[in-house]
């Protein structure tokens, strides 16, 4: 607790202090004051430097003495034999004796008193900027007229600060101006304008006299504007450093004049006025601007037009032009919104073909469709190839944006069928050799696939159950083969209207207009074991002369067993009809003359026993095509005889196909047209 | 050459088991269908049991029924007949045979094409 | 189950005699029948598939016919080789089910 006084005295005084002491003493007085020290005795074992024993005087980190030896008072008026005056209201005395005292020392005894300083005169650092009044523990700031005392009780200033300009024009100078601005002073000045208009400072050269920057090149006083996160200056110095004319970009701007003690010169005056923000005239890639200006200002209003193959792209949904309007703050309304290349996104993939994974599916980028060589083709044409349009779609020059439509390629065999003599009198083929070769198991039968969706087949084959089980790739008919194939599941049978329903099928004699259409469920997908047989031309090239070979192909009944389990085929020509007339029926169900033989039948077959048998009904009798040798089409069904080895009668799937196409478009799906 | 060799046959007490096996070779067998049947001393052929290409779908006998299992191994080309709670009246040449079976949904059996020599099972206390 | 009923069950015969042998079906089971020989010590041998069907390698005197229930297997000139005991075999369902044989003999 501090004291106004106290008394100090050395151990056992006024005895002789002992050896080996160390004491020391902590004297506080209160704030305000100093501490005025004296010694009225002093009797101390005498040593250099004090060495041996000594009082020690501490104030802060100063030794302010170390006292040792005997002194007596110089003034017979009074005791004080020495004394400490310090202007620190903290002081530590510290005694201490060594090991061995030759005499006998007493000691000391000392008094301290708290003292007044004067706080105005006493230290190097003047508490007060401009007048310093002390009076006993304490002192007090004062400020000429028109200054006022800052917070801190010690700084004086002017009170230049608080004025808000909202006009959009105006004269801001310091105080006093053209007279010596005050000293130690912070003027802050707002100017405040309405959104939209930037502030626009001007000074002359001349009207700018600030005291100037130190050695370092620091200003002393100094001239600043704040316009948001922008600075400019400090400025200082005779004569205005900066830009004569500050574009603030900002409808606020804050000038903040700082003035040190020292010195005043003449000051500054400045104009300001608001302009209107201008907003920049941008370089937006790939558009137009409309209206075309040279500068553009607060509140204009411009529309941005994507060039051909550019899109704003905003969210999903793209557009070719935006407005854009110059804001308040400079910045253009929508500037996030660029006109970018028109993506035409990835390409559709197409049923039975593909398209390359396109570099890029921007504007002007090319993609090629193709089909599934060698077993589709581009039916509508374009040649596959696609660039990415201005309006987003790939487009085509020949279709547009419609996508290529790959077709099964037709009577187009992987492997062509080479006979190897030993169906009745036929090889062994595979079905890479007749790959449009269906297989029915119920009635045992066969049938030939014309597309990805119709099977044609004989009448007699389907007229007894309308929903047939069919395969398709399989040579064998063994089960576990015909498992691993693939299996057709029939949507609808159509029969030819002018086929003859009978109650006792077996004891049929008219086989007149066998043919029937059954459309699959699904697609059929086509490769080196599944594909079409093409359907005759309408023209007099696919009429069938005697003699003309056709191939037929199919798992009945063989010389060796009543079933084949892998495929047979033979080459047979075509025959005058009358050669199957004359062949007697092998197990006749009625006459001779009662079975029907018409012009929509082929007769084929008599050469080396060659012919088809029961179980290849419906099986194609497949020729090849007069305008193109690669490929073969159906020139018959197989559809009855009269013994098998001999003669083999067909349906002429020529005089069907008309009947053949209207009922395939008149029962096709959307997907297929 | 188309071959079927049956092993496995022994001599053994009522009531005890026994495996047959049928090693076939110079055909796919998983393309056929397998037949067990057997021929009691001096007696006709009787029909165990039977096991289509996969190993879906089995029969039997009502003789047997419950008491042998019928199964194959494609990757081995082997036919097995697993004989448990052997009679008496089981003592006999067991010989597997070769079963075609042709068409898909509707199918078309050719039973017993081909036939192995046998193996003999006797039980007897 | 159906039962294959054979007759004869035995036959004596003379090499080139013509020889007929029937099976009977306890119900019908349209042309699923196959018949088989079988030599003393051998295993048997299909002769005939599908009722009428010849089994490849088999000699042409040998014929089979019949459907529904009704079946029959010839051999229209009896040879010293076929002296065997033949089967019918039913395979319409399970359980296969074979006729009790007959044993062609020399007379």
């Known amino acids: 607790e501090p004291t106004m006084y106290g008394e100090i005295l050395s151990p056992n005084y006024p005895q002789a202090y002992p050896s080996e002491v160390e004491k020391s003493w902590d004297i506080e007085v209160p704030e305000g004051y100093g501490i005025h020290l004296y010694f009225t005795h002093l009797d101390i074992e005498l040593s250099e430097n004090c060495a041996y024993d000594s009082v020690q005087i501490i104030s802060g980190d100063t030794e302010e003495g170390r006292l040792c030896g005997q002194r007596s008072s110089n003034n017979p008026h009074s005791p004080i034999v020495e004394e400490f005056q310090v202007p620190y209201n903290k002081l530590q005395v510290i005694f201490k004796s060594d090991f061995s005292n030759e005499e006998r020392f007493t000691g000391f005894a000392a008094y301290y008193v708290a003292t007044d300083i004067n706080e105005c005169t006493d230290f190097v650092d003047v508490p007060c900027s401009h007048f310093c009044n002390n009076f006993i523990g304490g002192y007090f700031c004062s400020c000429p007229p028109e200054y006022f005392l800052h917070d801190d009780m010690k700084n004086c200033g002017v009170n230049c600060s608080g004025d808000v300009f909202t006009a959009l024009i105006g004269e801001i100078a310091s105080p006093n101006y053209p007279k010596p601005y005050p000293e130690n002073s912070r003027c802050e000045y707002q100017i405040r304008l309405e959104k939209g208009f930037q502030v626009v400072v001007t000074l002359r050269r001349e009207d700018f006299d600030v005291e100037a920057a130190d050695s370092a090149g620091n200003c002393l006083d100094s001239l600043v504007f704040v316009a948001g996160d922008r600075q400019f200056g400090p400025y200082c110095g005779h004569g205005f450093p900066g830009p004569l004319n500050i574009e603030t970009k900002s409808n606020a701007l804050d000038i903040i004049f700082q003035t040190d003690l020292t010195g005043q010169k003449k000051g500054w005056k400045l104009r300001y006025h608001g302009d209107p923000m201008p907003c920049p005239k941008e370089d937006t890639p790939n558009s137009v601007w409309e209206p075309a200006k040279a500068k553009y200002v607060f509140r204009d209003v411009v529309q941005i037009t994507c060039l051909d193959g550019f899109e704003v792209v905003e969210g999903r949904v793209g557009a070719t032009s935006f407005y854009s309007t110059c804001q308040s703050n400079g910045k253009w309304s929508n500037s996030k919104l660029k006109c970018q290349p028109v993506d035409c996104g990835i390409p559709e993939s197409i049923e039975n073909g593909k398209v390359e994974d396109p570099e890029s599916t921007l504007f002007g980028s090319v993609i090629r469709y193709t089909c599934e060589e060698p077993y589709y083709y581009m039916e509508n044409g374009g040649g596959g190839e696609y660039h990415c349009a201005g309006n987003g779609s790939w487009v085509n020059e020949v279709l547009g944006p419609e996508l290529p439509k790959c077709v099964p390629v037709c009577g187009v065999p992987r492997e062509p069928f080479e006979e190897k003599q030993r169906i009745i009198g036929g090889s062994d083929a595979d079905i890479k050799n007749f790959p449009w070769q269906v297989f029915f198991d119920n009635p045992w039968a066969g049938g030939a696939l014309i597309n990805e969706y119709w099977v044609l087949t004989a009448a007699h084959v389907v007229e007894g159950n309308r929903e047939p089980t069919m395969y398709v790739g399989s040579t064998s008919v063994q089960t576990s083969r015909l498992a691993k194939s693939k299996m057709l599941t029939p949507e609808h049978v159509f029969i030819h209207p002018g086929w003859k329903l009978l109650e006792v099928p077996e004891g049929r004699t008219n086989f007149d207009n066998d043919i029937a259409l059954v459309r699959l469920k699904d697609p059929v997908k086509m490769g080196p074991t599944v594909s079409p047989i093409c359907l005759p031309g309408t023209s007099s090239d696919y009429n069938l002369m005697d003699g003309d070979l056709g191939l037929i192909s199919g798992w009945g009944r063989t010389e060796k067993r009543d079933r084949a389990v892998r495929l047979k085929a033979a080459r047979l020509p075509v025959a005058p009809l009358r050669k199957c007339k004359e062949v007697k029926v092998e197990k006749p169900t009625a006459d001779a003359e009662a079975y029907v033989f018409t012009p929509n039948m082929i007769c084929a077959g008599g050469e080396k026993g060659m012919d088809s048998c029961k179980g290849d009904s419906g099986g194609a009798f497949a020729v090849q095509d007069p305008n193109d040798k690669t490929k073969f089409y159906a020139a018959g069904l197989v559809s009855w005889g009269p013994q098998c080895g001999t003669y083999g009668l067909y349906t002429r799937v020529k005089n069907y196909v008309d009947w053949i196409m209207k009922t395939m478009q008149e029962n096709s799906t959307p997907r297929e047209d | 050459e188309v071959q079927l060799v049956e092993s496995g046959g022994g001599v053994v007490r009522p009531g005890g088991s026994l495996r047959l096996s049928c090693a076939a070779s110079?055909?796919?067998?998983?393309?056929?269908?397998m037949s067990w049947v057997r021929q009691a001393p001096g007696k006709g052929l009787e029909w165990v049991s039977g096991i289509n290409w996969e190993g879906g779908s089995t029969g039997y006998a009502d003789s047997v029924k419950g008491r042998f299992t019928i199964s194959r191994d494609n990757a081995k080309n082997s036919l097995y007949l697993q004989m448990n709670s052997l009679r008496a009246e089981d003592t006999a040449l067991y010989y597997c045979?070769?079963?075609?079976?042709?068409?898909?949904?509707?199918?078309?059996?050719?039973?017993?094409?081909?036939w192995g020599k046998g193996t003999t099972v006797t039980v007897s206390s | 189950d159906i039962q294959m009923t054979q007759s004869p069950s035995s036959l004596s015969a003379s090499v080139g005699d013509r020889v007929t042998i029937t099976c009977r079906a306890s119900q019908g089971i349209r042309n699923d029948l196959g018949w088989y020989q079988q030599k003393p010590g051998k295993a048997p041998k299909r002769l005939i598939y599908t009722a009428s069907n010849l089994q490849s390698g088999v000699p042409s005197r040998f014929s089979g016919s019949g459907s529904g229930t009704e079946f029959t297997l010839t051999i229209s000139s009896l040879q010293p080789e076929d002296f065997a005991t033949y089967y019918c075999l039913q395979y319409k369902q399970y359980p296969l089910t074979f006729g009790g044989g007959t044993k062609v003999e020399i007379k």
């Open positions: 045979a070769r079963d075609e079976q042709l068409g898909g949904i509707k199918y078309y059996y050719y039973y017993m094409d081909v």
């Open positions: 110079g055909f796919t067998f998983d393309d056929y269908g």
